[in-house]
Interface confidence: low
């Protein structure tokens, strides 16, 4: 049996994945739980097994199809239920009417690469992964650069208010190791949130030429 309050949060990656986290304050002892997705529009349903991520929270990914397939649209409603086994029965622990395009979290940008590096600047590009064609150009990005002796949390955020998959970092220090990350967010959706940060891209600025100020 389960007591206490629960929180059930899910996000759609805009293509073929719904990721869910279920948090339960009460004790959950040796119980198998799953998320069940029943789309109102589609002739399929999907389940995933909730796996513990901490003492009181579980997560799973509903894989709806091939990674780049457009499995849901802006008018879909997906009934999401947390079901936990109680003996031979499944008990509904949480339920929500999930509107995919109101609850978006895209995949982290991929394929970060240095296009051009100099002593004081670096041009970096990236690609978005598994993002719906519905967005067209309605995306924004945040980027951050890790400087020596600082933490990611201290890094100032650079905001790109349009779908621009590159950035030119200025005022860098010559011959210095940096790391760079970027994340993406659609403009659509009341509960939409930022994607995870991309994998860091490490790069080094060129050393200053002796006797020259570049």
């Amino acid at each position: 049996a389960v007591n206490g309050t629960s929180q059930f949060t899910c996000f759609y990656n805009s293509r073929a994945n719904i990721s869910c986290v279920w948090s339960q304050d009460g004790a959950l002892q040796d119980t198998s739980c799953q998320v069940h997705a029943w789309p109102d529009r589609r002739r399929w349903n999907q389940t995933c097994e909730l796996l513990p991520v901490s003492q009181a929270s579980w997560a799973c990914n509903l894989i709806l199809g091939a990674p780049d397939s457009q499995k849901l649209t802006t008018v879909d409603i997906v009934t999401l239920r947390v079901l936990c086994r109680e003996g031979v029965r499944w008990r509904v622990m949480a339920i929500q009417d999930f509107k995919p395009f109101e609850n978006l979290r895209l995949m982290a940008p991929i394929s970060l690469q240095v296009v051009h590096v100099e002593t004081h600047r670096c041009n970096i590009s990236w690609e978005i992964s598994q993002a719906s064609h519905y967005f067209e150009r309605h995306l924004e990005f945040e980027a951050r650069t890790l400087s020596p002796g600082h933490t990611w949390e201290e890094a100032p955020l650079l905001t790109l208010k349009q779908k621009q998959e590159w950035i030119c970092l200025e005022t860098l220090t010559p011959d210095t190791q940096y790391e760079f990350q970027v994340r993406v967010k659609p403009l659509q959706g009341e509960f939409t949130t930022w994607s995870p940060w991309s994998q860091p891209l490490a790069f080094r600025t060129k050393p200053a030429a002796l006797g020259k100020d570049t």
Epitope: W38, P39, D40, R41, R42, R43, T73, T74, V75, I77, T79, I95, Q96, D97
Partner: antibody, heavy 119, light 106 residues
Framework: EVQLLESGGGLVQPGQSLRLSCAAS????????VHWVRQAPGKGLEWVGV???????DYNAAFISRFTISRDNSKNTLYLQMNSLQAEDTAIYYC?????????????WGQGTLVTVSS | DIQMTQSPSSLSASVGDRVTITCSGS?????MYWYQQKPGKAPKLLIY???NLASGVPSRFSGSGSGTDYTFTISSLQPEDIATYYC?????????FGQGTKVEVK
């Protein structure tokens, strides 16, 4: 067998309120979205709104300020609360449910209940 | 809102005739639905998802189309087909219906 039975219609004066009921049988309202559709005399069909299986609602913007859809799970019954009624709200009000997949179209309809708004 | 325009608004045909009704959307829609309504009765679903026949519906009814233009056909009109027919889109909210086509027998 899936059945929907509307009730609560009648004659009301302009500005008054009315609550329509839709008793569902053959399925549980926590498993399917149920819609309200209205039809003015001699006119076409107009979608009012829906209450989804989890309890959330979507409305036609034309009605969102005056109409509220709710339900009583224990009675397996849906409601349409209509406030500030006007003559143009005179219509037959139907509740409808889609097939096993809610976008299979409105496969199930009630018989409708007539609301007449007149002084 | 997507406006659905049906044509014709009414038609008269003989038993056995092929009857075609068109429905045009003000914007592109993904799925179209067709209903039959007889006087004093609730609508009855005939076609779902553009071209699929609802359960128990005779095969003389069919639907086709894509984008903004959809067609509903009765291949051989029968006396019991006298009714008003409505198209409906379910691609965006609010859901909208055509104004109806009244089919009569000559």
């Amino acid at each position: 067998e899936v059945q929907l039975l509307e009730s609560g219609g009648g004659l009301v004066q302009p500005g008054q309120s009315l609550r329509l009921s839709c008793a569902a049988s053959g399925f549980t309202v926590t498993s399917y979205g149920v819609h309200w559709v209205r039809q003015a005399p001699g006119k076409g069909l107009e979608w009012v709104g829906v209450i989804w299986s989890g309890g959330s609602t979507d409305y036609n913007a034309a009605f969102i300020s005056r109409f509220t859809i709710s339900r009583d799970n224990s009675k397996n019954t849906l409601y349409l609360q209509m406030n500030s009624l006007q003559a143009e709200d005179t219509a037959i009000y139907y509740c409808a449910r889609a097939g096993d997949y809610n976008y299979d179209g409105f496969a199930y309809w009630g018989q409708g209940t007539l609301v007449t708004v007149s002084s | 809102d997507i406006q659905m325009t049906q044509s014709p608004s009414s038609l008269s045909a003989s038993v056995g005739d092929r009857v075609t009704i068109t429905c045009s959307g003000s914007s592109s829609v993904s799925f179209m639905y067709w209903y039959q309504q007889k006087p004093g009765k609730a609508p009855k679903l005939l076609i779902y998802d553009t071209s699929n026949l609802a359960s128990g519906v005779p095969s003389r009814f069919s639907g086709s189309g894509s984008g903004t233009d959809y067609t509903f056909t009765i291949s051989s009109l029968q006396p019991e087909d006298i009714a008003t027919y409505y198209c409906q889109q379910w691609s965006t909210y609010p859901l909208t219906f055509g104004q109806g086509t009244k089919v009569e027998v000559k």
